[in-house]
């Protein structure tokens, strides 16, 4: 039995649980998902039993090997997978555990502007990047467009201070998870500050 193997998959995609064995006479191989039987294989008996019928079309064994390929992944396929190789030649079964994380492909992140202060011609505000559908394990990075890849700020919230008369700079937020990344529409501090100031003036009027 080896250490737990961590695997990553994307919704709609496929993942292969790697498994090798040098056992000559394998009596059965049993795969379970969160303690529920998933597949039982009898290499000598010639049968493969997929416990739940809906999983039949999702289960495959690449190149006729022991590894299990699971396709059409869903979010709720995330969890613990366990395989046991049973053989009369083994005193106890050979086992392997896997942890699968299934992630969604990220949609375009949304940028919101926090409360703004405008003192002495300097507009100070927070820009917050977020996913509308509350996707998990998302990392956010801010980039200043045209400044090369190394000009960035890590984190969902970016504090900006834009002084009137300064050259405007396009900013974009990148959201990423283990299977995808996505960019927000570029935002311009000058435009955000000017729009906010206009809104404030119209409210006072």
């Amino acid at each position: 039995s080896g250490p737990v193997k961590e695997l990553v998959g994307s919704v709609g995609g496929a993942v292969t649980f790697p498994l090798k064995s040098k056992v000559k006479q394998v009596d059965s191989i049993v795969w379970t998902f969160n303690t529920t039987p998933l597949v039982t294989i009898q290499p000598e008996g010639g049968t493969i039993i997929v416990t739940q019928n809906r999983n039949r079309e999702r289960v495959d064994f690449p190149d006729g090997g022991y590894s299990l390929k699971l396709s059409k992944l869903k979010k709720n396929d995330s969890g613990i997978y366990y395989v046991g190789i049973y053989s009369s030649s083994l005193q106890q079964p050979s086992t392997q555990e896997y942890v699968l994380h299934v992630y969604e492909h990220l949609s375009k992140p949304k940028v919101t502007m926090g409360l703004q202060s405008n003192k002495n011609g300097t507009c100070v505000t927070n820009l917050t990047c977020c996913m509308e559908h509350g996707e998990e394990d998302v990392i956010y990075t801010w980039k200043a467009l045209g400044q090369g890849d190394n000009q960035f700020h890590d984190g969902a919230t970016l504090s900006i201070a834009w002084r009137s008369g300064e050259k405007d700079q396009a900013l974009t937020c990148m959201a990423r998870n283990p299977v995808s990344n996505s960019f927000s529409t570029p935002v311009f501090p000058q435009k955000l500050c000017e729009d906010a100031a206009t809104d404030l003036t119209s409210l006072r009027g």
Epitope: K22, G46, I48, F61, G64
Partner: antibody, heavy 120, light 108 residues
Framework: QVQLQQSGPELVKPGASVKISCKAS????????MNWVKQRPGQGLEWIGR????????KSNGKFKGKATLTADKSSRAAYMQLSSLTSVDSAVYFC?????????????WGQGTSVTVSS | DIVMTQSHKFMSTSVGDRVIITCKAS??????VAWYQQKPGQSPKLLIY???FRYTGVPDRFTGSGSGTDFTFTVSSVQAEDLAVYYC??????????FGGGTKLEIK
């Protein structure tokens, strides 16, 4: 990639013996069963037997007992089948074929076949 | 030994047609049936194992089904390159493994 290369065609006299070879590459030869299958001209397929090169264990079709002897050499990654006391009914194409791991009775890679002709 | 019977020695079909080849086992073999394709002058090629599992790289127009004693192999939309002999084989439990007599698929 997996390849099974068989020895060339054989023309042998009745009563003689012949040994044909199957050289494997591209996979763990010792840990996969190797099968031998007979096909007479214009006929179907007949399973002769299989050998596990790791320890030389064999399983055979009773019909070929005393006719076919299966051996394997791990160091040269080759499987062999010797056919003895040949008669005209032994004239056929003989294939070696690797068993899949997941289903030992299903054969996924086949050699190109060795033609054996028994004629005086 | 288990006898595998393919009732049709020949089947004639047209490109684009759906064709079903049947195979009957003389006793219960659960789902332990494989299907092979053999083109003229070539070695057999594994298409299906354990009744319904498509081998890697096999086009999805080829499907297999059945359990017990009755098995079917279907080509959903026949292509010209599918001209071949198709064999069923039982790989149930202890050998000997046995093959059906083969069904030759001919294109009209």
């Amino acid at each position: 990639q997996v390849q099974l290369q068989q020895s060339g065609p054989e023309l042998v006299k009745p009563g003689a013996s012949v040994k044909i070879s199957c050289k494997a590459s591209g996979y763990a030869f010792s840990n996969s069963w190797m099968n031998w299958v007979k096909q007479r001209p214009g006929q179907g397929l007949e399973w002769i037997g299989r050998i596990y090169p790791g320890d030389g264990d064999t399983k055979s079709n009773g019909k070929f007992k005393g006719k076919a002897t299966l051996t394997a050499d791990k160091s040269s990654r080759a499987a062999y089948m010797q056919l003895s006391s040949l008669t005209s009914v032994d004239s056929a194409v003989y294939f070696c074929a690797r068993s899949t791991m997941i289903m030992t009775g299903a054969m996924d890679y086949w050699g190109q076949g060795t033609s054996v002709t028994v004629s005086s | 030994d288990i006898v595998m019977t393919q009732s049709h020695k020949f089947m004639s079909t047209s490109v684009g047609d759906r064709v079903i080849i049947t195979c009957k086992a003389s006793q219960d073999v659960s789902t332990a049936v494989a299907w092979y394709q053999q083109k003229p002058g070539q070695s057999p090629k594994l298409l299906i194992y354990s009744a319904s599992f498509r081998y890697t790289g096999v086009p999805d127009r080829f499907t297999g089904s059945g359990s017990g004693t009755d098995f079917t192999f279907t080509v959903s939309s026949v292509q010209a390159e599918d001209l071949a002999v198709y064999y069923c084989q039982q790989h149930y439990s202890t050998p000997p493994y046995t093959f059906g007599g083969g069904t030759k698929l001919e294109i009209k």
